[in-house]
Amino acid sequence: EVEKTACPSGKKAREIDESLIFYKKWELEACVDAALLATQMDRVNAIPFTYEQLDVLKHKLDELYPQGYPESVIQHLGYLFLKMSPEDIRKWNVTSLETLKALLEVNKGHEMSPQVATLIDRFVKGRGQLDKDTLDTLTAFYPGYLCSLSPEELSSVPPSSIWAVRPQDLDTCDPRQLDVLYPKARLAFQNMNGSEYFVKIQSFLGGAPTEDLKALSQQNVSMDLATFMKLRTDAVLPLTVAEVQKLLGPHVEGLKAEERHRPVRDWILRQRQDDLDTLGLGLQGGIPNGYLVLDLSMQEALS
């Protein structure tokens, strides 16, 4: 907190300019009018104030706007944004995508800070949903943004926004998140033809159910092993050897290298060894010939 002292003669700031970087903190406090600062915020970012000096400028704005800054000021905060606390940001009403972009630009190249997370939360809540333009912007700055949302939050993403999602945006998503995103992607891409559809839906398949995988196996998609390994185990288990062979196409040979890993390991345990042998890959661990497989879950459902 800077002590209140009178501004020295001739030092009263007439405008926000480069000369102010030579002011000590107490001089900035005494000689810069808060209303002048607010109207000339766009200049602050171009002036190399130290972080300590920025603290003083923030203090002046806080006094002028105790209920939270107006968007006209927020949009031009620049480096001053780095001085804001999540508590400060919760007082804001940010509605313009341009304002959001301007503030994300300041934090570019850094991890998502609590300030940025709060800003995004305020913005998205204000809009009511994660529309395509917002999602485009957020994933451009933070490729992992989508996967930082809870399944509940993801449920507010409209299918039309899915077009903005790139494969790398889903890299850190867990199965629960993909469970929410997959049906939206399926809906978004439903009018595309086979091969184009597969290219778009591929990164979302970690949320696909068995029946959709069976359908894909009929379309010569040649799924790569990396995608196959990310499928839900419970969705892969009911697939037959023939279906997996069709699904993977030439990539089926990769199963051998993954036979000890899920979901391949668990899938092998469910297949007849005879059927596995037809692949000619030397996969072991299937059900020996002559054994009868009882599906107990089916039996429970009937009783």
């Epitope: 190399p48 130290t50 300590e52």
Partner: nanobody, 115 residues
């Protein structure tokens, strides 16, 4: 990694002269605006002088006419020539890239002026 090493400080009598040097590495020196900051014991950080990449210079009112900032791009060095020194110039002097927005921080070089 940005590195700035200040030197040239020392103890002199009022009215005498000192020349501080700051040698930089780890960034494009000739594209950078540089500044000298100082902090006297018990006082706050103060910007003394700046030199921009185009060579234009600025000074705090308290040192105008007495201090001169300059740079040698070939040596990645910025200088502060201090003349007519006064006891109130006693401080730790640090150089910074203006883009860092850090001000007084780090080692610096101590300048002590006795009357």
């Amino acid at each position: 990694e940005v590195q700035l090493v200040e030197s040239g400080g020392g103890s002199v009598q009022a009215g005498e002269t000192l020349r501080l040097s700051c040698t930089a590495s780890g960034f494009t020196f000739d594209d950078s605006d540089m500044g000298w900051y100082r902090q006297a014991p018990g006082d706050e950080c103060e910007l003394v002088s700046t030199i921009s990449s185009d060579g234009s210079t600025n000074y705090a009112d308290s040192v105008k006419g007495r201090f001169t900032i300059s740079q040698d791009n070939a040596k990645n060095t910025v200088y502060l020539q201090m003349t007519s020194l006064k006891p109130e110039d006693t401080a730790i002097y640090s150089c910074r890239t203006m883009a860092s927005r850090i001000g007084c921080w780090g080692q610096g070089t101590l300048v002590t002026i006795s009357s």
